[in-house]
């Protein structure tokens, strides 16, 4: 049950996060026109990573795409990159995730595969929190840097546009939002990694051998062979960890817990 | 048709109050930020204060901050500028504007004349 | 605040004449965003309140005769009359919409000789 709810609730959080990144990610208020100095500005600048936009007092809102690939810097391009990177890693740990939940039931698909699906996703999840994380903070270390720069440009040809040397730009909505979202997404994809533990086949971890001693024919269940087969008395079913050994008859191998961690 | 009319102009004191009124019509009046741009006689333009569309944000020129407020009521699709210690170089025609695209006023009422003398 | 100075004061020209007024700013009034000057001119004739002639120093607005045409970027503007006519008769402005305090040059008085 706990490991249901762990896994349901990362998926959301995971969920949750990525729909937050995909926001940032196509939000235009990464950075803000700093109003320290013009509080009263009757024009307000604001830029994405996709276009820079003018807000006039009058209420009209202007935004004008960068049309030029070659002619943004490479910090921003990288930004971009990061940031989509996170968004597929995301999506496709989300559609994973779906089918690797306890609670969906796709024909006759074993434990250990939902285990596998649930550990894939969640390290899915893990990157694409950091890359969201990384590309968010790269773009603030960007604007702190510039916010500095007693020179007039802050992107140098950025969409061919010039920044005059009174235009200084802060931190937009969207960074904040960026870190939340990279921060739940890596949340959720470490719920997924630890439901993953809980996930392995519900099994005992040796199988019956029979040993024909001189005429009689009984099945033995060795519960104290500590010092040959690594386990230790197991009366109760319980779950244990193997160390990856297996009995010679045993066909069919399932990946212990150790195998996703 | 876009109408921009002002009315409460008159003659008054120094040291005097004044309240001017916009009545607007022919357009979504709360959609657009609104000025008030005064003229003395013969002499030129001079911008008095602006209202955001939603009245959240004011902007006063120095010569009247503190003692002039702008106002708007989107109901009754009225623009207000109330004046208060009313000095003579406060004497003009003001006109109540309508911003648009850049910031430019496409439109201008008729303007109300105020005269602050003893 | 910006200081918006016009020249000339005042010109008088003969019909069908070519004629220009200049606008210039204390400060740059390019906003780096959209690539726009935020400078408005405007016409008012006598006894009546001023007519908005072009917004973003050169956007003509709707019903203004082609004979005007607006230019100029950063800090020197333009307004150019191709053929004065007697209609044209009246006082231009130029207009800061940059910042505020919105500011207005003194203007240019253009009479028929």
């Known amino acids: 049950m706990a490991v249901t709810a762990c896994q349901g609730l990362g998926f959301v959080v995971s969920l949750i996060g990525i729909a937050g990144i995909i926001a940032a990610t196509c939000m235009d208020q990464w950075s803000t026109q700093d109003l320290y100095n013009n509080p009263v500005t009757a024009v307000f600048n604001y830029q994405g990573l996709w276009r820079s936009c003018v807000r006039e007092s009058s209420g009209f809102t202007e935004c004008r795409g960068y049309f030029t690939l070659l002619g943004l810097p490479a910090m921003l391009q990288a930004v971009r990159a990061l940031m989509i990177v996170g968004i597929v890693l995301g999506a496709i740990g989300l559609l994973v995730s779906i089918f690797a939940l306890k609670c969906i039931r796709i024909g006759s698909m074993e434990d250990s595969a939902k285990a596998n699906m649930t550990l894939t996703s969640g390290i899915m999840f893990i990157v694409s929190g950091l890359c969201a994380i990384a590309g968010v903070s790269v773009f603030a270390n960007m604007l702190v840097t510039n916010f500095w720069m007693s020179t007039a440009n802050m992107y140098t040809g950025m969409g061919g546009m010039v920044q005059t040397v009174q235009t200084r730009y802060t931190f937009g909505a969207a960074l904040f939002v960026g870190w939340v979202a990279g921060g739940l997404t890596l949340i959720g994809g470490v719920m997924m990694c630890i439901a993953c533990r809980g996930l392995a086949p519900e099994e005992t971890n040796y199988k019956a051998v029979s040993y024909h001693a001189s005429g009689h024919s009984v099945a033995y269940k060795p519960g104290g062979f500590k010092a040959s087969t690594g386990f230790g008395s197991n009366t109760k079913n319980k779950k244990i960890y193997d160390g990856g050994a297996r009995t010679e008859d045993e066909v069919q191998s399932y990946p212990s817990k150790h195998d996703y961690v | 048709e876009v109408q921009l009319l002002e009315s409460g102009g008159g003659l008054v004191q120094p040291g005097g109050s004044l309240r001017l009124s916009c009545a607007a019509s022919?357009?979504?009046?709360?959609?657009?930020?609104m000025s008030w741009v005064r003229q003395a006689p013969g002499k030129g333009l001079e911008w008095v204060a602006t209202i955001i569309i939603g009245g959240s944000y004011t902007y006063y020129a120095d010569s009247v901050k503190g003692r002039f407020t702008i106002s708007r009521d989107n109901s009754k699709n009225t623009l207000y500028l109330q004046m208060n210690s009313l000095r003579a170089e406060d004497t003009a025609v003001y006109y109540c504007?309508?911003?648009?695209?850049?910031?430019?006023?496409?439109?201008w009422g008729q303007g109300t004349l105020v005269t602050v003398s003893s | 605040d910006i200081v918006m100075t016009q020249s000339p004061d005042s010109l008088a020209v003969s019909l069908g004449e070519r004629v220009t007024m200049n606008c210039k700013s204390s400060q740059s009034l390019l906003q780096s965003g959209n690539q726009k000057n935020y400078l408005s001119w405007y016409q008012q004739k006598p006894g009546q309140p001023p007519k908005l002639l072009f917004y973003w120093a050169s956007t003509r607005e709707s019903g203004v005769p082609d004979r005007f045409s607006g230019s100029g970027s950063g800090t020197d503007f333009t307004l150019t009359i191709s053929s004065v006519q007697a209609e044209d008769v009246a006082v231009y402005y130029c207009q800061n919409d940059y910042s505020y305090p919105f500011t207005f040059g003194q203007g240019t008085k253009l009479e028929i000789k």
């Open positions: 504007t309508r911003l648009v695209k850049g910031q430019a006023m496409d439109y």
């Open positions: 022919g357009f979504t009046f709360s959609s657009y930020t």
